[in-house]
């Protein structure tokens, strides 16, 4: 089966790489615009230059193109804890990231939030914090992992999943309660 091509891809595939087919005259192949520029006017004829203009401030194109407008620069989302790693240029979008000792959690493909890396108090670092993943902690005996923090087994209720990890402690608490000692 031949993959379905959109109209623009079909038109582009007729021309050699780095060129696109003129929208009004499919016998003409125009040179694409360089990154950092956009298409102002199609080339008037074969072998003639495409009229490309540089993107204005606040916009960019990151690859060769025949776009009628540059793309708007992304803004880093302060409310998500994001900081600007590098600012937008005519040929590169803004790069957003997190501060030191934080990691990115992606809520969706294009939305991330910065959170502090876990310190593994009452445990040990199994895997260090990375750009897109929190520290992985292993808890000491008498502690269990809840929301990536090591919590005392005294906070483990029978209904929770921690019961397997905290079973000896829970039995001890139960035994002490049942013994009736003062």
């Amino acid at each position: 089966l031949v993959p379905h091509l959109g109209d623009r891809e079909k038109r582009d595939s007729v021309c050699p790489q780095g060129k696109y087919i003129h929208p009004q005259n499919n016998s003409i192949c125009c040179t694409k615009c360089h990154k950092g520029t956009y298409l102002y006017n199609d080339c008037p004829g074969p072998g003639q230059d495409t009229d490309c203009r540089e993107c204005e401030s606040g916009s960019f194109t990151a690859s060769e193109n025949h776009l009628r407008h540059c793309l708007s620069c992304s803004k880093c989302r302060k409310e998500m804890g994001q900081v600007e790693i590098s600012s937008c240029t005519v040929d590169r979008d803004t790069v957003c990231g997190c501060r030191k000792n934080q990691y990115r959690h992606y809520w969706s493909e294009n939305l991330f939030q910065c959170f502090n890396c876990s310190l593994c108090l009452n445990g040990t670092v199994h895997l260090s914090c990375q750009e897109k993943q929190n520290t992985v902690c292993t808890c000491h005996a008498g502690f269990f992992l809840r929301e990536n923090e090591c919590v005392s087994c005294s906070n483990c209720k029978k209904s929770l999943e921690c019961t397997k990890l905290c079973l000896p402690q829970i039995e001890n608490v139960k035994g002490t309660e049942d013994s009736g000692t003062t």
Partner: nanobody
């Protein structure tokens, strides 16, 4: 105690509109970024939209961009989601929540309101 109470859900035909509300109490509403998330039957939570404390530069998921509008009234401690041009794939339980702070889970979110888009 933080309380978030959603309302406004219901059965609606494709192409129709609904406005969801979320009444907030137990915290300083005007100091918090607020979020709408949804859960379609048999699926995980999907981030729909969020709005910062002053209501500037709201975020929308690609799936709802241009159709949904998030807003807030800090004087009424209420968050809204105006949903237009509804589609069958918008069918879900919609929850309002406070933006998480400690980690990627929702410490505070409401009980949800069901939106069913069907003819």
């Amino acid at each position: 105690e933080v309380q978030l109470l959603e309302s406004g859900g219901g059965l609606i035909q494709p192409g129709g509109s609904l406005r969801l509300s979320c009444a907030a109490s137990g915290f300083t509403f005007a100091h918090e970024t607020m979020v709408w998330v949804r859960q379609a039957p048999g699926k995980g939570l999907e981030w729909v939209s969020h709005i910062d404390r002053v209501g500037q530069d709201p975020y929308y998921a690609d799936s709802v961009e241009g159709r949904f509008t998030i807003s807030r009234d800090n004087s009424k401690n209420t968050l809204y989601l105006q949903m237009n041009s509804l589609r069958a794939e918008d069918t879900a339980v919609y929850y309002c929540a406070l933006l998480p702070k400690r980690g990627p889970w929702f410490d505070y979110r409401g009980q949800g309101t069901l939106v069913t888009v069907s003819s």
